[in-house]
Interface confidence: low
């Protein structure tokens, strides 16, 4: 079989909303996804799994199931939101999202995502991890690949 | 219940300055921010600046980043607004209100100060 | 800045009568948009805040709502202390924004 390519695009959007007496951050982060079957049949994409790190804590995690199938040399963009909360020993970061002196309050999120797809009963999975700017302050919406953060500890692709 | 009681009006010349008060009571005063709007006579509502009781954190509109200095003093409760370089253009009711923790998200202005008259003449 | 342009800026109408009032926003502000009310004597309340959601204590005569970047205040029966001026406030971005006002006058 040929390959099953997936490739990470970036996030698309994030909806804010605060907890002012538990001083808690909550994101819904909607990230993008292009799935490109190389193979001359069609694959099930049968669950996308997905999680955010802020600070190597994990702060959020997604699962889809039963998604789409993908034909022939073809490609399908995939959206999936990841439900994410910023609290109790990372609740100091309440103060940074929520300083209104400040215009733009980004903070660096680890984004991973196992694919999972099957064909002809055979199973495979590909993962990806990317680094990402996200404000916390407000609701944004992003052009794709805007939010990207490249530093060295960046997984090599 | 929420309140936020304002100073009373003031007189004063062209060229001083003035410190108008805003005193909250019944809720969190350091969970909330205070924003501050003009209104001259006959005229409509203008957005000053709000204030982060808890860090002091302000955030101006451009309009009166010269004019106003907002402050807040967490021990009794109480936002200000310092007008400077006064001229009749600031001869208005100033109001005060509340709002949630921040400035982009969240319901906005849900109490108001009864406003404060600022006259300014010679 | 979002420009909030209000109107009518002065209505005359019956007791009893229906009318709505009309901000438009510049730019998107979602639904991050506040109807206040302004008494005579300068009290300012807030009506409605996220587009349509009543204040409590509000009357239910009162309602908000949306069409595109056009936001709307409802008064399904007027009644006399609900002749006053009105304003709608964004706060989708900073700095916030006013919509001129509109007189409310009775008939």
């Known amino acids: 079989p040929r390959s099953i390519d997936v490739k990470y695009i970036g996030v698309k959007s994030a909806y804010v909303s605060y907890d002012v007496q538990k001083r808690t951050i909550y994101l819904n982060i909607t990230n993008t996804l292009n799935i490109t079957n190389n193979n001359y049949y069609s694959v099930e994409v049968e669950n996308i799994t997905a999680q955010v790190q802020f600070a190597k804590t994990v702060i959020g995690k997604a699962r889809l199931n039963n998604i789409t199938h993908i034909g022939p040399l073809d490609m399908k963009q995939i959206d999936y939101t990841v439900p994410t909360v910023i609290a109790e020993e990372m609740s100091y970061m309440y103060d940074f999202c929520t300083l209104i002196s400040i215009k733009v309050h980004n903070i660096v999120l680890m984004m991973q995502v196992t694919v999972t797809t099957t064909y002809f009963g055979h199973s495979e999975q590909i993962s990806q991890e990317r680094y990402q700017y996200v404000d916390c302050g407000r609701n944004t919406t992003y052009q794709l690949g805007q939010s990207e953060y490249l530093n060295v500890l960046q997984p090599q692709q | 219940q929420v309140q936020l009681q304002q100073s009373g009006p003031e007189l004063v010349r062209p060229g001083t300055s003035v410190k108008v008060s805003c005193k909250a009571s019944g809720y969190a005063f350091t969970n909330y921010l205070i924003e501050w709007v003009k209104q001259r006579p006959g005229q409509g509502l203008e957005w000053i600046g709000v204030i982060n009781p808890g860090g002091g954190n302000t955030d101006y509109s451009e309009k009166f980043k010269d004019k106003a200095t907002l402050t807040a003093d967490k021990s009794s409760n109480t936002a200000y607004i310092q007008l400077s370089s006064l001229t009749s253009e600031d001869s208005a009711v100033y109001f005060c209100a509340r709002s949630p923790y921040s400035s982009y998200v969240g319901y906005a202005v849900d109490y108001w100060g009864q406003g404060t008259s600022v006259t300014v003449s010679s | 800045d979002i420009q909030m342009t209000q109107s009518p800026s002065s209505l005359s109408a019956s007791l009893g009568e229906r009318v709505s009032l009309t901000c438009r926003a510049s730019?998107?502000?979602?639904?991050?948009l506040n109807w206040l009310q302004q008494e005579p004597d300068g009290t300012i309340k807030r009506l409605i805040y996220a587009t349509s959601s009543l204040d409590s204590g509000v009357p239910k005569r009162f309602s908000g709502s949306r069409s595109g970047s056009d936001y709307s205040l409802t008064i399904s029966s007027l009644e006399s202390e609900d002749f006053v001026v009105y304003y709608c406030l964004q706060y989708a971005s900073s700095p916030r924004t006013f919509g001129g006002g509109t007189r409310l006058e009775i008939k």
């Open positions: 730019q998107d502000i979602g639904s991050n």
